[in-house]
């Protein structure tokens, strides 16, 4: 999947853009908004009717090296009595993010952008029957 | 910084941490196996905390289109299909990395940017705050 070229709606002098070898692009990995705070409601992973746990995956050849993944705790959803209701399903909600992958080929190092699917949390859904034709 | 295990036969001059600026291939590798978007495409409607998806478009960013979730109700949908206000629909937010064109409008020069997106909603028991 190639990154699309910028739209022709802009007029840009070529000399103001850094020179880049063909088939590649320049990427500054100093993150913009690095220190922004997530203001998500408190403990939603425990208070949800489809609760989840977090695990941290670590890969030194990935930037960022740490990616947090959620896993639904139950197959069903927690009802008002605190029991697991299996007429409903806890399902993962997922979001794609970008990471930079470092690859070693012999003594040379190359970098590749990668799309990674992160499980963010879980939601409770009503299952649907598959009707055989 | 991040330390990398390396071939011991390689010269040791290279920085073991990720450099501030890297040249990357224009092709993006997709690691997303074991997923099928068709399966989860209707969660926003079938959830007890349903949400609407709003398109956020920015040509200076990759991906240029990001879908933002907005919970449809304050409460959650009960077994009768009614909104139950004893429970709350809340957004699940996630920080993701995107590419920002830098300098602006340049076709092959980017900087990583962290953005906060609402991915979907979940139904939670509200916390009762007792005033001392």
């Amino acid at each position: 999947r190639k990154i699309p070229k910028v739209g022709h709606t802009f007029f840009q002098k070529p000399e103001s853009c850094p020179p880049v070898p063909g088939g590649s692009m320049k990427l500054d990995i100093g993150i913009i908004n690095e220190n922004q705070r997530v203001s998500m409601s408190r403990n939603i992973e425990s208070r949800s009717t489809s609760p989840w746990n977090y695990t941290v995956t670590w890969d030194p050849n990935r930037y960022p090296s740490e990616v947090v993944q959620a896993q639904c705790r139950n197959l069903g959803c927690i009802n008002a009595q605190g029991k697991e209701d299996i007429s409903m399903n806890s399902v993962p909600i997922q979001q794609e993010t970008l990471v930079v992958r470092r690859k070693h080929q012999g003594c040379s190092v190359s970098f590749q952008l990668e799309k990674v699917l992160v499980t963010v949390g879980c939601t409770c859904v009503t299952p649907v029957i598959h009707h055989v034709q | 910084g991040i330390t990398i295990p390396r071939n011991p036969g390689c010269p040791n001059s290279e920085d073991k941490n990720f450099p501030r600026t890297v040249m990357v291939n224009l092709n993006i590798h997709n690691r997303n196996t074991n997923t099928n978007p068709k399966r989860s495409s209707d969660y926003y409607n079938r959830s007890t905390s349903p949400w609407n998806l709003h398109r956020n478009e920015d040509p200076e960013r990759y991906p240029s289109v990001i879908w933002e979730a907005k919970c449809r109700h304050l409460g959650c949908i009960n077994a009768d299909g009614n909104v139950d206000y004893h429970m709350n629909s809340v957004p699940i937010q996630q920080e993701i990395l995107v590419l920002r064109r830098e300098p602006p409008h340049c076709p092959n020069s980017f900087r990583l940017e962290k953005i906060l997106v609402s991915v979907g909603c979940t139904c939670v028991t509200p916390i009762v705050h007792h005033v001392a």
């Epitope: 069903g76 007429s87 806890s90 399902v91 993962p92 859904v125 299952p127 598959h130 | 074991n34 077994a79």
Partner: antibody, heavy 123, light 107 residues
Framework: EVQLVESGGGLVQPGRSLRLSCAAS????????MHWVRQAPGKGLEWVSG????????GYADSVKGRFTISRDNAKNSLYLQMNSLRAEDTALYYC????????????????WGQGTTVTVSS | EIVLTQSPATLSLSPGERATLSCRAS??????LAWYQQKPGQAPRLLIY???NRATGIPARFSGSGSGTDFTLTISSLEPEDFAVYYC?????????FGQGTKLEIK
Amino acid sequence: EVQLVESGGGLVQPGRSLRLSCAASGFTFDDFAMHWVRQAPGKGLEWVSGINWNSGSIGYADSVKGRFTISRDNAKNSLYLQMNSLRAEDTALYYCAKDIAAAGEFYFDMDVWGQGTTVTVSS
Amino acid sequence: EIVLTQSPATLSLSPGERATLSCRASQSVSSYLAWYQQKPGQAPRLLIYDASNRATGIPARFSGSGSGTDFTLTISSLEPEDFAVYYCQQRSNWPPTFGQGTKLEIK
């Protein structure tokens, strides 16, 4: 024809292990959650374990939790049950069954069943 | 866990008669109850799901009713192939559980 065929049963001593397999055909295997259900000789049905389409959600009956492991290989259209630390009370006919829910989720009602494979735990 | 109690344990009837099988849950299972038929030496077969919906290919003489804790499987006019063991199963609370079965035998 929609079909499930179990294999791997047999006579085993208490404390030993056994691996059951279930080969699916005639339907899109990775579109459905799958289950193992057992039936002790002359007794009723007992749900043992279930697994969703991509192995992301798995559940076990309390009687087998920590001893049995359910898994699937969608490329091979196969479902498995690894049974460790077997006990006399695990003696049963083990059925592989397909869930009726769409999207590989759980409905916990089962519309296609295999003919079963017999597991006997005895010294 | 939810206990399902089926009655009677054995029901003796003749072909052409009406059969009424009962399943009672130890607590409400709403309408999340299924019925299965099992003939000797065969695998179970799904008849009814969600208390009253017939599964694909199930004849109209089979019908299910009830909600909450009390459920009934009715076979309007018994055919020779209907003599079997019938199980109810709930999918309301964890874990899914089955009743002990009702044996429908020829009188």
